[in-house]
């Protein structure tokens, strides 16, 4: 808390301007009116004000809005943003994309902060929705952003959102994200036709069922093996030796560099090795000629 | 990477003034504060002041007012420093220098001109 | 302006040394003070920011720790390669200013 003194005579701020930056702490805090401050905030962020002197800046736009700034303050903050909290900006109601792009500007290049998630979910959570525009800038700012939501989170994606995702932006989701995300780039992309669907849904495989990979190797899609070992493990299960043969395409021959890792080592587990030999790999570990296989998981949901 | 490039060394005159560079690349030259910094032998550091390349904007410390002149040139990504009346006193190791806003540390520094004023 | 005083103008260490170098601000600072490195014919190099956060690629054994008018940057286990002179800086207003340096030498 910055002491009540008077301002010295003739320092008494007209304007906000460079001059200021000379000032003390107390100096500021006396002979800056708070309103002039807000009227100019646009100015602020060209000044190279010190972040101790930020305090003050922000000292005097607390006691000004004490109930949150309004939105044409939160604009201008600049590097004023940085002396936030999150309890501060609970009390924003940020509205305007472009607000939401000034702020994010002043903490680029750095990890999300507690105050930048505060702010997205505010923001988003004033939209109702994660459109495209605003996902768009969010994972413009933060790659990673999609995939720090929870699956709840996420269902509020709409579709036509989907568009606007890069493969990168997927690069640390789990598979309970992708099992929410999946789905809904399969309805955006639905009426491209096979090898540009493929391109666009192929980073969203993660969640995609076995009925949906059995499709795909009708489809001479060629998928390359980091993205099959993304897939979900209960869905390659059930693919047969000529299906995975064909949804691999030429990359089937990396098979047997991953056989020892999921989903490839479960998946040889459960096919006849007669089968597995007919790819010439060398993959081992197949169901020996001559053994029969039971479905227990069937029987029991039968009985 | 980022880089300032300096001079290596300028010897003058007493009463002259010289004219020092600061080149940069590595980064958007327009988007950041550029500082210059003194160094006399064997003492520490003195700020002398910053300008903005975008806006021409300039702060000096009140010591160096009648002594440094900032300047840049933004289509050669170049700040300049003149230093003018020179003196014995002025004989010292100057760099430019890039900071972090709005904490006012300095993460780039230039490579520093050695400045010699002699007869 | 703000004084920033580095008391000791010269400390004698040996490889493997815990070492202490201070500085002292005229005014309360908050945590707003920066420490470099400098060997001869070099340019300064970044080391400590905001009084206790290491530059990127900095080794950990440099640590800084302070607020207000006291602060200190300690190198855990003197290596030949750390010796050098050390500045401190304060950033909290206006004009910026420069502590005169400690400079490391062997015993």
């Known amino acids: 808390e910055v002491e009540k003194t008077a301002c010295p005579s003739g320092k008494k701020a007209r304007e906000i301007d460079e001059s200021l930056i000379f000032y003390k702490k107390w100096e500021l805090e006396a002979c800056v009116d708070a309103a002039l401050l807000a009227t100019q905030m646009d100015r602020v962020n060209a000044i190279p004000f010190t972040y101790e002197q930020l305090d003050v800046l922000k000292h005097k736009l607390d006691e000004l809005y004490p109930q949150g700034y309004p939105e044409s303050v939160i604009q201008h903050l600049g590097y004023l943003f940085l002396k936030m909290s999150p309890e501060d900006i609970r009390k924003w109601n940020v509205t305007s994309l472009e607000t939401l792009k000034a702020l994010l500007e002043v903490n680029k290049g750095h990890e999300m902060s507690p105050q930048v998630a505060t702010l997205i979910d505010r923001f988003v959570k004033g939209r109702g929705q994660l459109d495209k525009d605003t996902l768009d800038t969010l994972t413009a700012f933060y790659p990673g952003y999609l995939c720090s939501l929870s699956p709840e989170e996420l269902s509020s994606v709409p579709p036509s959102s989907i568009w606007a995702v890069r493969p990168q932006d997927l690069d640390t989701c789990d598979p309970r994200q992708l099992d929410v995300l999946y789905p809904k780039a399969r309805l955006a992309f639905q009426n491209m036709n096979g090898s540009e669907y493929f391109v666009k849904i192929q980073s969203f495989l993660g969640g995609a069922p076995t009925e949906d990979l059995k499709a795909l190797s009708q489809q001479n899609v060629s998928m390359d093996l980091a993205t099959f070992m993304k897939l979900r493990t209960d869905a390659v299960l059930p693919l047969t030796v000529a299906e995975v043969q064909k949804l691999l395409g030429p990359h089937v021959e990396g098979l047997k560099a991953e056989e020892r890792h999921r989903p490839v080592r479960d998946w040889i587990l459960r096919q006849r090795q007669d089968d597995l030999d007919t790819l010439g790999l060398g993959l081992q570990g197949g169901i020996p000629n001559g053994y029969l296989v039971l479905d227990l998981s069937m029987q029991e949901a039968l009985s | 990477q980022v880089q300032l490039q300096q001079p290596g060394a300028e010897l003058v005159k007493p009463g002259a003034s010289v004219k020092l560079s600061c080149k940069a690349s590595?980064?958007?030259?327009?988007?950041?504060?550029m500082h210059w910094v003194k160094q006399r032998p064997g003492q520490g550091l003195e700020w002398i002041g910053m300008?903005?390349?975008?806006?021409?904007?300039?702060n000096y410390n009140e010591k160096f007012k009648s002594k440094a002149t900032l300047t840049v040139d933004k289509s050669s990504s170049t700040a300049y420093m003149q230093l003018s009346s020179l003196t014995s006193e002025d004989s010292a190791v100057y760099y430019c220098?890039?900071?972090?806003?709005?904490?006012?540390?300095?993460?780039?520094w230039g490579t520093g001109t050695t400045v010699t004023v002699s007869s | 302006d703000i004084v920033m005083t580095q008391s000791q103008k010269f400390m004698s260490t040996t490889v493997g040394d815990r070492v202490s170098i201070t500085c002292k601000a005229s005014q309360n600072v908050g945590t707003a003070v920066a420490w470099y490195q400098q060997k001869p014919g070099q340019s300064p190099k970044l080391l400590i920011y905001?009084?206790?956060n290491r530059y990127t690629g900095v080794p950990d054994r440099f640590t800084g720790s302070g607020s207000g008018t006291d602060f200190t940057l300690t190198i855990s286990n003197m290596q030949s390669e750390d010796l050098a002179d050390y500045f401190c800086?304060?950033?909290?207003?206006?004009?910026?200013?420069f502590g005169a340096g400690t400079k490391l030498e062997l015993k």
């Open positions: 800086q304060q950033s909290s207003s206006y004009p910026l200013t």
């Open positions: 590595g980064y958007t030259f327009t988007s950041y504060w």
């Open positions: 300008i903005h390349p975008n806006s021409g904007s300039t």
């Open positions: 220098a890039r900071p972090v806003v709005p904490y006012w540390y300095f993460d780039v």
């Open positions: 905001s009084a206790s």
